[in-house]
Interface confidence: low
């Protein structure tokens, strides 16, 4: 049976197709193609008589067709117009007529399609923002991808029923993008340039650092603030409700006790008009603030009576503090065995008596805060029991206390000494 | 039908002030954003500024020529726009367009007729 | 800010020949668009984003180019194509027009 093949079926525009033959019978006067379903004389393209080897152009002939002489028929530069049926009639021998119909689709060269907003600046959690992918092109699919991915579910994303226009019903800072839309045809796919959203957002509650509050006289203070914000938050620094400067970054140098006070960053976002303020309160004192817990080395915790001595050390890592120390809830020193050394670091008990037995801590203060030890037990026998060592009998090991404590015993001292 | 009609045009004197308006028909007024161009007599085009659509909260942006002189608004209700022009110079004679704006590529799919302003003492 | 230029600044031809308008950026650029102008007309939305047709602009119109250059040709040219035509490009917040190509007849 005579049929027609198109090779290829769909075909870009601008190039070309061949309707191909099978089946060709033999002992033919010759042919001719029509287009459309149906032989019409008003709509044939070309005849060919094989006996001539002539091939004659008919009503529909556009120069852009080519028969050969197997009865394939070439079309090139094909254009949407040529997207349809073509039928081909044989003409026999017997005079009798066969025909077979073909068809092929002409598809447009899809344009570079590009994305168009309703809201270049969409402020978040207020906006909705619609993306239509342009232009407009019958027979098109049109796809989107979010940050390179197809689209996510999401209750805030939408698109149209012909999924050209994706809609997000109500902006974040993180649906900025890069947005991409593609059509395709049966043929090729084409993507859009990215399109980045410029959402508006912020300024969110600023944040000072460092975090520091306590400072001493004599350094330099610098603060930095920072607000999440597009665009960028523009800062202002406020001391005790006064104006200071209009910048991101604050620096005293030198500062005294006078610059204590209330630090005010403010944060504001000159496209939407909000602002935020975040407060710190910043001490310069030489004092030390909030102090540490500090804590009680022996040289030993268990001594024979009337014969071993004991130091007992005061640890801390506070600066600008004073030291006590404290036995059976009484203030220390309490006899003239007990000795304080070190700015009050260490306390010395030599020799170790019978009522020297009992819990000891020390505590350290300044005229903000204190903070105590927990205690420490020193048992006093006087029998031969084995020795709880922590350090060296003779005390030789507390060089190592003391040399690691040097820096704080001087400033503890100083301290000590201009405070009381 | 999309119809977009200037009207207010006239003779004015180097620093005197007047407020063109545009009616628009034919489409959701709130959704596009609305420009005007002028065109000065016998000299190209030139784009003075635009106002965004309700979804951009009507934001407004002006050309560096215009900038604090013009000021554009729309009035939802009446689906007009209006260019208020103060301190105009000779050099602000024009024919004054508005137009339509597909969105933020400045495609101007509609043009109104255009309504003329003379500046002259 | 980009500078459109466009060439030649008059062209005349007569209908049935090819018109070519150019349209020069002075950095490269994705898209432009074109408008064409009658005298004492509002000018109209001819062709969008470089290559598209706007809604009832015949197909002998046809727009190309990329980065700098952009070209406005018209096939075969009939006598309600003798016009002004300018291209236009938009920077972030601000449109462009070239200062426009008059097509005239020979």
């Known amino acids: 049976q005579l049929t027609t093949e198109s090779m290829p079926f769909n075909v870009a525009e601008g190039k070309e197709v061949l309707l191909l033959v099978h089946n060709l019978p033999q002992q033919l006067f010759g042919y001719s193609w029509y287009k459309g379903e149906r032989v019409d004389g008003n709509r044939q393209i070309v005849g060919y008589a094989i006996g001539t080897q002539q091939a004659t152009p008919g009503p529909a002939n556009s120069g852009r067709e080519t028969i050969y002489p197997n009865a394939s028929l070439l079309i090139q530069n094909v254009t949407q117009n040529d997207t349809g049926f073509y039928t081909l009639q044989v003409i026999k021998s017997d005079l009798v007529n066969e025909e077979a119909t073909g068809q092929f689709h002409v598809y447009p060269e899809l344009p570079k399609p590009f994305i168009t907003s309703n809201n270049s600046n969409p402020v978040e959690d207020e906006d909705a923002v619609a993306l239509t992918c342009e232009p407009e092109i019958q027979n098109t699919t049109y796809l989107w991808w979010v940050n390179n991915q197809s689209l996510p579910v999401s209750p805030r994303l939408q698109l149209s029923n012909d999924n050209r226009t994706l809609t997000l019903l109500s902006v974040t800072r993180n649906d900025v993008g890069p947005y991409e839309c593609g059509i395709q045809n049966k043929l090729s796919v084409d993507h859009s340039d990215p399109v980045i959203l410029n959402v508006l957002y912020g300024p969110d509650d600023p944040t000072i650092s460092p975090s520091y509050t306590y400072y001493r006289p004599g350094v330099n203070l610098s603060l930095s603030c920072h607000a999440a914000s597009n665009p960028p938050a523009q800062y202002s620094w406020l001391i005790d409700g006064n104006i200071q400067q209009h910048t991101q970054e604050l620096f005293i140098s030198n500062i005294t006790e006078k610059n204590s006070g209330l630090y005010t960053c403010q944060a504001n976002n000159s496209a939407s008009g909000h602002s935020r303020t975040t407060v710190k309160t910043i001490t310069v004192s030489a004092l030390s603030p909030v102090v540490a817990k500090p804590q009680i080395k022996a040289s030993k915790t268990t001594v024979t009576g009337d014969k071993d001595s004991v130091n007992l050390t005061c640890s801390t890592n506070d600066t600008g503090i004073s030291i006590r120390w404290f036995f059976k809830n009484q203030s220390l020193p309490s006899s003239e065995r007990m000795k304080l050394s070190q700015g009050n670091i260490t306390l010395s008990i030599n020799p170790v008596k019978r009522e020297d037995a009992g819990t000891y801590w020390c505590e350290v203060f300044n005229p903000i805060s204190k903070n105590q030890s927990d205690p420490i037990m020193l048992n006093v026998n006087y029998n031969a029991l084995p020795q709880e060592n922590l350090i060296n009998v003779d005390g030789s090991g507390l060089n190592d206390i003391f040399e690691a404590q040097k820096i704080e015993w001087h400033e503890a001292r100083a301290h000590h000494h201009h405070h009381h | 039908e999309v119809q977009l009609l200037e009207s207010g045009g006239g003779l004015v004197q180097p620093g005197g002030s007047l407020r063109l308006s545009c009616a628009a028909s034919?489409?959701?007024?709130?959704?596009?954003?609305m420009n005007w161009v002028r065109q000065a007599p016998g000299k190209g085009l030139e784009w003075l500024g635009f106002i965004g659509n309700k979804a951009n909260a009507y934001t407004t942006e002006y050309s560096a020529s215009v900038k604090g002189r013009f000021t554009i608004s729309r009035d939802k209700s009446k689906n007009t726009l209006y260019l208020q022009m103060n301190s105009l110079r000779a050099e602000d004679t024009a024919t004054y367009y508005c137009?339509?704006?597909?969105?933020?590529?400045?495609?101007?799919?509609?043009w109104g007729q255009g309504t003329t302003v003379t500046v002259s003492s | 800010e980009i500078v459109l230029t466009q060439s030649p600044a008059t062209l005349s031809l007569s209908p049935g020949e090819r018109a070519t308008l150019s349209c020069r950026a002075s950095s490269s650029v994705t898209y432009i668009h074109w408008y064409q102008q009658k005298p004492g007309q509002a000018p109209r939305s001819w062709i969008y984003a470089t290559s598209n047709l706007a809604s009832g602009i015949p197909a002998r119109f046809s727009g190309s180019g990329s980065g700098t250059d952009f070209t406005l040709t018209i096939s075969s040219l009939e006598p309600e194509d003798f016009a002004v035509y300018y291209c236009q490009h938009w920077s972030s917040k601000s449109p462009t027009f070239g200062q426009g190509t008059k097509l005239e007849i020979k």
């Open positions: 137009t339509r704006d597909r969105g933020i590529r400045f495609q101007f799919d509609y």
């Open positions: 034919g489409f959701t007024f709130t959704d596009y954003y």
